[in-house]
């Protein structure tokens, strides 16, 4: 008898090379094989559970950056006046959550913020839990 | 044929709002659906394997905090003279281990230490390994 | 009917107590039960997917340390002029990758670098994806 295979784990890696002040970062998924989707510049959460979250990037100017998942809830990450980020976190997310950036900068620059090595990874840690598609 | 489902992953999120000097932090599990259990202020390990461990909190006074898993072994985390923690680690734990806090403070205060956003998450990384219940 | 079990997750913990200048760190796997293998001082990657990577150690002298996975690609970790490391990261690795150290030190010492608590852990996060053995 063939041993059971794992159904694919919900995970995604998105890249971002540009962020807009008082808006967010423009995210793109380089792979078509991702098991999670990007919609309206947000990562859509279909499955309840803990997620491992990795966030990296070098920014062209000092900024304050937050990563949100639900209106009215505190951010998953919040970094104030940084020019780079290399953080890992764990958070409980649920169906209908959307993971998105908010960025603010206080410089007089009129350029969008350039990002080098901008990468956000989400990996579901509780396969077998509730999912809705 | 229905594709195989994942059995639930061993994971737990506990919260703590108070720590006692020369003792530990009073942990509570806000969800009844957790796949791991709290007993005598410790998280009980039933399954061998690597665990992803996330520890967060803001403390009302400076303290030294350690997170232990087995008598005679070094701590999973050890923080000296801090007022906050936001750490992630990976450790190999095994059946019969118990994860618990030890806290010391050098202030003359007779109050328990208050904790804001105190959260400890454990997520098993090796489903399919040995478990005993 | 017996519920399906998880096939073993690809994971490994290696230890290192010694690093050689302009070479790497001598890694050994303390357990014979590991699901990943060490070959020519490198950890062999058989399965595509995200990996959780934990790196720890205290060094006998200041060094610059990088952890590589593929020729011509940037490092998974890069630490400059440190005497200790305690880092966690997430990276996408693929079949045929090999995870190995590179170490440089600027001291005049002719001794190998001694390492206390040197530990590297890799845990595959996408079971169910492509593997080749």
């Amino acid at each position: 008898q063939v041993p059971p295979q794992y159904p694919p784990i919900q995970s995604i890696r998105v890249q971002f090379t540009r962020c807009e002040n008082e808006k967010g970062c423009i995210i793109t998924s380089p792979s078509k094989d991702e098991t999670m989707k990007v919609q309206d510049n947000s990562i859509i959460i279909n499955c309840d559970g803990f997620y491992l979250i990795s966030l990296k990037g070098y920014f062209s100017e000092e900024l304050s950056l937050s990563l949100y998942y639900r209106k009215g809830r505190g951010p998953l990450f919040s970094l104030s006046k940084v020019t780079s980020v290399d953080s890992i976190g764990v958070a409980y997310l649920a169906f209908k959550d959307k993971v998105y950036f908010n960025v603010t900068t206080h410089s007089t620059s009129y350029k969008d913020i350039q990002v080098n090595g901008g990468e956000l990874i989400l990996i579901h840690q509780n396969p077998g839990g509730f999912c809705a598609y | 044929q229905v594709p195989p489902q994942y059995p639930p992953i061993q994971s737990i999120r506990v919260q703590f709002t108070r720590c006692e000097n020369e003792k530990g932090c009073i942990i509570t599990s806000p969800s009844k659906d957790e796949t791991m259990k709290v007993q005598d202020n410790s998280i009980i390990i039933n399954c061998d394997g690597f665990y992803l461990i996330s520890l967060k909190g803001y403390f009302s006074e400076e303290l030294s905090l350690s997170l232990y898993y087995r008598k005679g072994r070094g701590p999973l985390f050890s923080l000296s003279k801090v007022t906050s923690v936001d750490s992630i680690g990976v450790a190999y734990l095994a059946f019969k281990d118990k994860v618990y806090f030890n806290v010391t403070t050098h202030s003359t205060s007779y109050k328990d230490i208050q904790v804001n956003g105190g959260e400890l998450i454990l997520i098993h990384q090796n489903p399919g390994g040995f478990c005993a219940y | 009917q017996v519920p399906p079990q998880y096939p073993p997750i690809q994971s490994i913990r290696v230890q290192f107590t010694r690093c050689e200048n302009e070479k790497g760190c001598i890694i050994t796997s303390p357990s014979k039960d590991e699901t990943m293998k060490v070959q020519d001082n490198s950890i062999i990657i058989n399965c595509d997917g995200f990996y959780l990577i934990s790196l720890k150690g205290y060094f006998s002298e200041e060094l610059s340390l990088s952890l590589y996975y593929r020729k011509g690609r940037g490092p998974l970790f890069s630490l400059s002029k440190v005497t200790s490391v305690d880092s966690i990261g997430v990276a996408y690795l693929a079949f045929k990758d090999k995870v190995y150290f590179n170490v440089t030190t600027h001291s005049t010492s002719y001794k190998d670098i001694q390492v206390n608590g040197g530990e590297l852990i890799l845990i595959h996060q996408n079971p169910g994806g492509f593997c080749a053995y």
Epitope: R18, E20, N21, E22, K23, S60, E61, T108, S109, Y110, K111, D112, Q114, N116 | - | -
Partner: antibody, heavy 121, light 112 residues
């Protein structure tokens, strides 16, 4: 091939208004900051206003602050300069310029042909 | 604002000779990101300006290798070797390290 084509320049009376347009082609418009640079007769070059690729950030020189408004329509690949309360000293050729896309600083790698604005009674 | 001062204001050079234009900034143009945002532009008669050199010494696409930029900090030079009739026009330096972007007052190059 990158092209920037300005229009809207005219003769206008002091305190009057004018709207300049610049239609861009040959590059991903929304990814680049755009600027208006002017050159008064027999004078040098002066940055007047700039706007980020996404349109959320703007810059104005002190000389035009509160009178001029820069905007963009990324769907139409067009950047605008609304000029109000015009003064004689605003007389100049107005160039639309594309940012070079450098990491943090600025330069202008492509320029339009310019449009002449004359403020006179 | 950073003031950019160009010398000389005008320059007359024979064909095939080398022309040099100097540009001085009132403060260092070294950005916190490690780059120096100093550019050189040429405005030919009746035309709009065109970028020649960016980041102090990098030739823009399609620019002849007869044009070279050098310098650091506050002092910069544009050299045009083997000058041709087509090089006639006004040369401007400009800095983009700090807003506002500011230009030098220009150097007019005439070919004898």
């Amino acid at each position: 091939e990158v092209q920037l084509v300005e229009s809207g320049g005219d003769l206008v009376k002091p305190a009057g208004s004018l709207r300049l347009s610049c239609v861009a082609s040959g590059f991903t418009f929304s990814s680049y900051s755009m600027s208006w640079v002017r050159q008064a007769p027999e004078k040098g070059l002066q940055l007047v206003a700039g706007i980020s690729g996404g349109g959320s950030r703007t810059y104005y020189s002190d000389a035009v602050k509160g009178r001029f408004t820069i905007s963009r329509d990324n769907a139409k690949n067009t950047v605008y300069l609304q000029m109000n309360s015009l003064r004689a000293e605003d007389t100049a050729i107005y160039y639309c310029a594309k940012d070079g896309g450098s990491w943090a600083g600025y330069n202008f790698d492509y320029w339009g042909q310019g449009t002449l604005v004359t403020v006179s009674s | 604002d950073i003031v950019m001062t160009q010398t000389p204001p005008s320059l007359s050079v024979s064909p095939r000779e080398t022309a040099s234009i100097s540009c001085k900034a009132s403060q260092s143009l070294l950005h916190s990101d490690g780059s120096t945002y100093l550019d050189w532009y040429l405005q030919k008669p009746g035309q709009s300006p065109q970028l020649l050199i960016y980041l102090g010494s990098n030739r823009f696409t399609g620019v002849s290798d007869r044009f070279s930029g050098s310098g650091s900090g506050t002092e910069f030079t544009l050299r045009i070797s083997r000058v041709e009739a087509n090089d006639t026009g006004v040369y401007y330096c400009g800095q983009g390290t700090q807003l506002p972007y500011t230009f030098g007052q220009g150097t007019e190059l005439e070919i004898k």
